[in-house]
């Protein structure tokens, strides 16, 4: 697990405690919460990121319009339970005994039920479209320029393959940015465009995740781009399954 | 070469609280976990917790959270595990272990707590 | 929490037979398994790491394996001094487990 060796610490994760008493003296950086030994030369997955964040001591339009079956995360936090993977369990419950089914983000994707609730497996969220709002500027970006910066920043910054950036749009003064990722298409090692949206969802937030980096200065050529509203959808591979009544 | 020296066996009323230190020397004090782990008589082995001393990082087992502090004092390289609220269950040899990687390589002598009335 | 079930309970062989001791966890854990020896009156003892990493001062006999859920320690040939209580201990995730610990007795 690659962490900078010289100080222990890790880059993509300041929410780990580090000690290189690992295997062959290495550094050794496990994620607050879970316990869990991570990965330091990628990102975290945001099921060991969340139940860091519980431990921790409380602190012609262009434009997409969000399918039916679009989740968004109305929920808020919980205390996820995580696989060994440090991917969502399928089935989530909490301490009273409530349990819900969620996707691959850890977003519910049915209703409310009791200990008797099966989730079968983890359903895939496929197409995440993050929908950003930013600050009045003298005038409007040039789309492309947008378009190049948001690529670079989800390459560089939170190492996602640009084949997973499918598009950016922008209408002044919203822009969309949309990431796909089929299982077919998701190799060992690429980053997952859930883990890369929840980096930036922190980012936007001036909540970064990363390790002694400064918070994420996004500028269009040379012209900041502050965002002052972020409402991400989530798109699973088999729609959800939620009663009438909560769709009415 | 490494050692953790634990401090004298106890006997306690329930109810009352007893701190165990285990003192570490032969390697650097901050750069590995101390954990502390307990043994009833004729039982197994139970994981209570874990401090790193670099930066007193805890981490309890759910089970003591709400009774067990570790603290640790780097002049001494000295780590301490306090149990309040002692109860005839607690009755136990409790280990300091350290560990190089993942595993507990070195042990303290274990501390005898007897909670009796 | 992880669970580990060790198997069997009690062993009874006699010196110079070859011991196979089990340990099954209740998720995948990868190679994160750590086996010990105990004896009465005595702390624990590291005698393998990470499933199958043999621990310096530990005698070759003693040799583990397995990765995932199902782990094994075994110990080639029985020697007097082997006859104790073996627990394996995973490091995968807080809050660190031990098994239920199997006894090795003499036949």
């Known amino acids: 697990h690659t962490a900078a060796q010289d100080n222990c610490t890790c880059p993509t994760n300041k929410m780990t405690v580090c000690s290189p008493d690992g295997p062959g003296g290495r550094c050794q950086c496990r994620a607050l919460g879970s316990g869990m030994a991570v990965d330091c030369s990628t990102l975290t997955s945001k099921c060991l990121l969340l139940k860091a964040r519980m431990s921790a001591p409380k602190n012609a339009r262009t434009l997409v319009r969000p399918s039916e079956h679009a989740l968004v995360d109305n929920d808020g936090l919980y205390d996820p339970d995580c696989d060994p993977e440090g991917r969502f369990k399928a089935r989530q419950c909490n301490q009273t005994s409530v349990c819900w089914c969620v996707n691959s983000v850890g977003v519910r994707r049915t209703d409310k039920g009791d200990l008797s609730l099966r989730c079968d497996e983890l359903v895939r969220t496929h197409h995440i479209l993050i929908d950003l709002r930013h600050r009045p500027t003298a005038g409007a970006f040039n789309h492309s320029d947008l378009d190049a910066e948001l690529r670079r920043l989800f390459r560089e910054r939170y190492r996602l393959h640009p084949k997973f950036v499918a598009a950016v749009h922008y209408e002044q003064p919203t822009i969309q940015i949309e990431l796909r990722q089929n299982t077919s298409q998701k190799a060992a090692g690429d980053v997952d465009i859930g883990d890369a949206a929840y980096y930036f969802e922190r980012d936007i937030k001036g909540e970064s995740l990363f390790q002694g980096r400064g918070g994420l200065d996004l500028r269009v050529r040379g012209e900041p781009l502050q965002v002052e509203r972020t409402l991400i959808y989530y798109l699973d591979e088999i729609p959800p399954k939620f009663s009438m009544k909560r769709l009415t | 070469q490494v050692q953790l020296v634990q401090s004298g066996a106890e006997v306690k009323k329930p109810g009352a609280s007893v701190k165990v230190s285990c003192k570490a020397s032969?390697?650097?004090?901050?750069?590995?976990?101390i954990n502390w782990v307990r043994q009833a008589p004729g039982q197994g082995l139970e994981w209570m917790g874990n401090?790193?001393?670099?930066?007193?990082?805890?981490n309890y087992n759910q089970k003591f959270k709400d009774r067990v502090t570790m603290t640790r004092d780097t002049s001494t390289s000295t780590v301490y595990m306090e149990l309040s609220s002692l109860r005839s269950e607690d009755t136990a040899v409790y280990y300091c272990?350290?560990?190089?990687?993942?595993?507990?390589?070195?042990w303290g002598q274990g501390t005898l707590v007897t909670v009796s009335s | 929490e992880i669970v580990l079930t060790q198997s069997p309970a009690t062993l009874s062989l006699s010196p110079g037979e070859r011991a196979t001791l089990s340990c099954r966890a209740s998720?995948?854990?990868?190679?994160?398994i750590h086996w010990y020896q105990q004896k009465p009156g005595q702390a624990p003892r590291l005698l393998i790491e990470?499933?199958?990493e043999s621990i310096s001062g530990i005698p070759a006999r003693f040799s583990g394996s397995g990765s995932g859920t199902d782990f094994t320690l075994t110990i080639s040939s029985l020697e007097p001094e082997d006859f104790a209580v073996y627990y394996c201990?995973?490091?995968?995730?807080?809050?660190?487990?031990f098994g239920g610990g199997t006894k090795v007795e003499i036949k």
């Open positions: 990470f499933a199958s």
């Open positions: 272990a350290s560990y190089r990687s993942d595993g507990f390589a070195y």
């Open positions: 201990q995973q490091s995968n995730s807080w809050p660190f487990t």
């Open positions: 401090i790193y001393p670099s930066n007193s990082y805890t």
């Open positions: 998720q995948n854990i990868g190679t994160s």
């Open positions: 032969g390697y650097t004090f901050t750069s590995y976990w």
